[in-house]
């Protein structure tokens, strides 16, 4: 058993049929010694008396808010949550496996630049009685500070018969050094509580590996005289790190016909313009990637050819 | 060329070669799938490679003030990785396929280090740890880790030379 926060405790249980459970001793936070009784949740049934209560925690029915009273007055509360371990593996019932980039990916994180700011998100099908708390640091043995905000519900989607809820959180490294080569990864820890079930999820990454630039901005076409060719130009996204002579991007320009089956023409360039042939009903798209490190490409910025 | 005394390197040549190094480092080890390193014990396989850190003057302001600190750091790293790529970790079993980009990568690391430090000038180099894995699979693990950290190192070096070529070239 360990303390998650004041008056909230997590009991770690090996979860299998007829498991013996864990013996837990609760102590009433009071100077009083006599006439103390204990109840669980809303029930008025007295579970025991005395300053301490010893219980055997085996299942969710044994978890909940234990309250000690004296003469009708509440003295203190202890909320017990359960953390299940099945076959040596902690349960992951609350969050959905996003399976990208690999199985058992529950948290996904992205950064728009090297400033030390990043966003993480996760998915669940649970809509109520759900709380999250997020902590982060750079490195684990001698951790350096990363400040995370509160997790918020950022999207709701319908998937078949189920609703899916996306939560996200923004974090900022306290003393980021955008030009340095990271040697210690960022660690993100999410505590998830659904009713009386506790779970924790972690992710470890370098900012450089989660970089995904915003799409190029101000995408424009300029027809070239007496030619089917056009000059496409664009600019670095505002959110990208500066100076651009140092934090450089590379770009992919694509000409795509109306039909998805039509052949795509692609050009790669380090410049912020390119000359391409504009076909009727086609569109021109440009995306960006860090020039020197193969992290994710941005989403496409597109304009129609007409 | 970056002479230890303080004259300027051939920024444009360094830019071109460092960009080539980035391409080679990624072709030597693209991110195919996601290797599960957790199940491979890391004992005997950790390696303290040199990193370009915050105080090394490799940021745009530091380069403007005095690029020598940063160039020396890059040079140290290039020599370190060049030695690693020529060591038993990469020459031992399982042997690399003949068309592996590691040979080119090795040569390019040497080329860039020589551009930064011509013959007869000596910057201090970091001692390379003697890493001779007792198991062939540990070589695979070390190759993986070395190439992943080399990708990060050469990315910073390439940014430095790109910025230098754009803003510090005479």
């Amino acid at each position: 058993i360990w303390e998650l926060k004041k008056d909230v405790y997590v009991v770690e249980l090996d979860w299998y049929p007829d498991a013996p459970g864990e013996m837990v001793v609760l102590t009433c936070d009071t100077p009083e010694e006599d006439g103390i009784t204990w109840t669980l949740d809303q029930s008025s049934e007295v579970l025991g008396s005395g300053k301490t209560l010893t219980i055997q925690v085996k299942e969710f029915g044994d978890a909940g808010q234990y309250t000690c009273h004296k003469g009708g007055e509440v003295l203190s509360h202890s909320l017990l949550l359960l953390h299940k371990k099945e076959d040596g593996i902690w349960s992951t019932d609350i969050l959905k496996d996003q399976k990208e980039p690999k199985n058992k990916t529950f948290l996904r994180c992205e950064a728009k630049n090297y400033s030390g700011r990043f966003t993480c998100w996760w998915l669940t099908t649970i809509s109520t009685d759900l709380t999250f708390s997020v902590k982060s640091s750079r490195g684990s043995s001698d951790p350096q500070g990363v400040t995370c905000g509160a997790a918020t519900l950022s999207a709701e989607r319908v998937r078949g018969d189920n609703k899916e809820y996306e939560y996200s959180v923004e974090c900022q490294e306290d003393s980021a050094c955008p030009a340095a080569e990271e040697s210690l990864p960022i660690e993100v820890m999410v505590d998830a509580v659904h009713k009386l079930k506790y779970e924790n999820y972690t992710s470890s990454f370098f900012i450089r590996d989660i970089i995904k630039p915003d799409p190029p901005k101000n995408l424009q076409l300029k027809p070239l005289k007496n030619s089917r060719q056009v000059e496409v130009s664009w600019e670095y996204p505002d959110t990208w790190s500066t100076p651009h002579s140092y934090f450089s991007l590379t770009f992919c320009v694509q000409v795509q016909g109306k039909s998805k089956r039509e052949k795509k023409d692609r050009v790669f360039t380090d410049k912020t313009s390119a000359t391409v042939i504009c076909r009727k009903n086609a569109s021109i798209s440009v995306r960006a990637q860090d020039r020197y490190y193969s992290s994710s490409w941005s989403e496409w910025a597109s304009v129609p050819c007409s | 060329r970056a002479v230890p005394g303080g004259s300027s390197p051939a920024w444009t040549q360094c830019q071109q070669l460092s960009q080539k190094l980035c391409t080679l480092a990624w072709s030597a080890h693209p991110l195919v799938g996601h290797m599960d390193l957790r199940e491979e014990g890391d004992e005997e396989t950790t390696n303290d490679v040199p990193h370009i850190q915050c105080g090394d003057g490799c940021d745009p302001q530091g380069l403007r003030d005095n690029s020598q600190f940063c160039l020396q750091r890059i040079h140290q790293g290039l020599i370190f990785y060049e030695k690693l790529l020529g060591s038993d970790i990469f020459t031992g079993e399982p042997s690399l396929l003949p068309d592996s980009p590691v040979g080119q990568l090795h040569a390019s690391l040497l080329g860039l280090s020589q551009l930064l430090q011509p013959e007869g000038h000596h910057w201090e180099t970091q001692q390379i740890p003697s890493l001779s894995p007792s198991q062939p699979w540990q070589r695979l693990l070390l190759r993986f880790k070395i190439l992943r950290s080399l990708q990060a190192f050469v990315a910073v070096a390439a940014r430095v030379f790109a910025h230098g070529a754009a803003t510090l070239s005479p």
Epitope: - | H29, M35, E39, L96, L97, V102, P136, W137, F144
Partner: antibody
């Protein structure tokens, strides 16, 4: 075609040594390793060690506690396996095999004992 | 050392029937979670062994009635339709850790 030709059968006294040769032809000797495997009468296979002439690396089965020495002569494309302090339980057929052990930079990797010698019977008897 | 345990020791199967040989390692013999360092060899009487399955790949020239599967510590060699020429002893071999180790062998015969 690839061939590994081993030296002939040997009868040895306990406590003595035996040196078995394995002459390779039909391929570039230094591009592959040579592995030694033995098989006691009616028993299974036992890996003794292997040598890679190109890297100079040799791997041994510690079970033989320094009794086995594997060498290669690049000039004659011949590999040797010497086993000392012989005992009766060393009576076995000793095989050499060409080993190919290659990988992309990291993985997957490929390990094959793809061509074998005919085997050399070593009998240890007083 | 990694101990390789093969089962069964011997197996008698009718012609055209399926034969399944198991090999269990005392430690994981996959690398990076996916790459297999487990190989299968066939040895006929009076002959040296012959490689039939390399990691997760059937050697060229080996009939496709042979198939290999498994990861981690548990591996299987299956002959989907046993032929007379498949009578032999089959050995698994791990080359993740030196010393490389063979299983004890499984003798396949015709019933």
């Amino acid at each position: 075609q690839v061939q590994l030709v081993q030296s002939g059968a040997e009868v040895k006294k306990p406590g003595s040594s035996v040196k078995v040769s394995c002459k390779a032809s039909g391929y570039t000797f230094t591009s592959y390793g040579i592995t030694w495997v033995r098989q006691a009468p009616g028993q299974g296979l036992e890996w003794m060690g292997e040598d890679y002439p190109r890297s100079g690396n040799t791997y041994y089965n510690e079970k033989f506690k320094g009794r086995v020495t594997i060498t290669a002569d690049k000039s004659t494309s011949t590999a040797y396996m010497e086993l000392s302090s012989l005992r009766s339980e060393d009576t076995a057929v000793y095989y050499c095999a060409r080993s190919e052990f290659i990988s992309t930079v990291v993985a997957p990797y490929y390990y094959a004992l793809d061509y074998w010698g005919q085997g050399t019977l070593v009998t240890v008897s007083s | 050392d990694i101990v390789m345990t093969q089962s069964p020791d011997s197996l008698a199967v009718s012609l055209g029937e399926r034969a399944t040989i198991n090999c269990k390692a005392s430690k994981k013999v996959t690398i990076f979670g996916s790459t297999s360092a487990l190989h299968w060899y066939q040895q006929k009487p009076g002959q040296p062994p012959k490689l039939i399955y390399n990691g997760a790949k059937l050697e060229s020239g080996v009939p496709d009635r042979f198939s290999g599967s498994g990861s981690g510590t548990d591996f299987t060699l299956t002959i989907s339709s046993l032929q007379a020429e498949d009578v032999a002893v089959y050995y698994c071999l791990q080359n993740k850790e030196v010393p490389y180790t063979f299983g004890g062998g499984t003798k396949v015969e015709i019933k």
